[in-house]
Interface confidence: low
């Protein structure tokens, strides 16, 4: 599989992966206690023909044009996922594994 | 036990300033957002001000912006709210609580402390 | 801002009978709303966040319902001790908002 990367000054216009670091403090999630913030990264940019696009499926679908289908969109292909400390809601302290946390790549789907 | 315990209220002249204390303890005080709520005589609730746990995001009402000023002590389970060119209009009851965040709101509250502001 | 009406602002109950109070958002506000009790000369207490969970240690009487803009506060079976000032508040975004307050009285 492959995925491009950018960064905020980058020029390029189709799907594309961005960093972004998410701060948990600044949305009020105090319940998370570490991290308290990580690099979460989101996609971006166009979808244009067969570019990125992770299953045939997609460009098929788009070529028959069936009613009420999108054009293919810019989304995360593989995520990671990252440990956290945090209280649940009965105020224990968990320690865990939270699957798809992080946008490891990004393809059109 | 979650507790927190109010002081510094009193009887001030208009324009005259306060300092208010809440004391925390029984929770891991920096890792929780705190607030202040005030209540005026037979009125309903006010959001005074809230500090996000290591004081990084301060967040004030519209219309109390510039007179009051948030502050929190993590090494010393505090958070403090500094009233200035106090006005008769703030006469109230004022609560700190805990917050646990946008999922969760604030759960805690502290027993209360008078304001008064009258010449 | 986000403006909250809560109502109505009071209400005559006896003991045993259902209560409802409601509390409408101005914009979607999803389900972060919290419904806190008080009584006289004493500190709000927290009943329900997340608009439908109950806080730790309240009893199962009091329950919270809706998301988005409309919510609501039910007792099934009022008791004695729940003769106090109910207010909704809005924690999605700064700054916060408290509805006016509902006053439940003995009829």
């Known amino acids: 599989d492959f995925g491009l990367d950018c960064d905020e000054h980058s020029t390029e216009s189709r799907c594309c992966r961005y960093p972004l670091t998410v701060d948990f403090e600044a949305f009020g999630w105090d319940w998370i206690i570490a991290p308290k913030r990580y690099k979460a990264n989101y996609c971006s940019g166009e979808c244009e023909f067969v570019f990125l696009q992770k299953y045939p499926h997609t460009h098929l679908v788009h070529q028959a044009n069936p009613r009420g289908s999108a054009g293919p969109c810019c989304t995360p292909t593989k995520m990671s996922p990252i440990n956290m400390l945090y209280f649940n809601g009965k105020e224990q302290i968990i320690y865990g594994k939270i699957p798809a946390m992080v946008v490891d790549r990004c393809g059109c789907s | 036990q979650v507790q927190l315990v109010q002081s510094g209220g009193g009887l001030v002249k208009p324009g005259g300033s306060l300092r208010l204390s809440c004391a925390a303890s029984g929770f891991i005080f920096n890792t929780y957002t705190m607030n202040w709520v005030r209540q005026a005589p037979g009125k309903g609730l006010e959001w005074v001000s809230s500090?996000?746990?290591?004081?990084?995001?301060?967040f004030y009402s519209d219309s109390l912006k510039g007179r009051f000023t948030i502050s929190r002590d993590n090494a010393n389970n505090s958070l403090f709210l500094q009233m200035n060119s106090l006005r008769v209009e703030d006469t109230a009851v004022y609560y700190c609580?805990?917050?646990?965040?946008?999922?969760?709101?604030?759960?805690?509250w502290g027993q209360g402390t008078l304001v008064t502001v009258s010449s | 801002d986000i403006q909250m009406t809560q109502s109505p602002s009071s209400l005559s109950a006896s003991v045993g009978d259902r209560v409802t109070i409601t509390c409408r958002a101005s914009q979607d506000i999803r389900n972060d709303l919290g419904w806190y009790q008080q009584k006289p000369g004493k500190a709000p207490k927290g009943l329900i966040y997340a608009a439908s969970s109950l806080q730790s240690g309240v009893p199962s009487r009091f329950s919270g319902s809706g998301s988005g803009t409309e919510f609501t506060l039910t007792i099934s079976s009022l008791q004695p001790e729940d003769f106090a000032t109910y207010h909704c508040l809005h924690y999605d975004f700064h700054p916060r908002t408290f509805g006016q307050g509902t006053k439940v009285e003995i009829k």
């Open positions: 500090i996000t746990s290591r004081g990084t995001y301060i």
């Open positions: 609580s805990r917050d646990r965040g946008y999922t969760f709101g604030p759960d805690y």
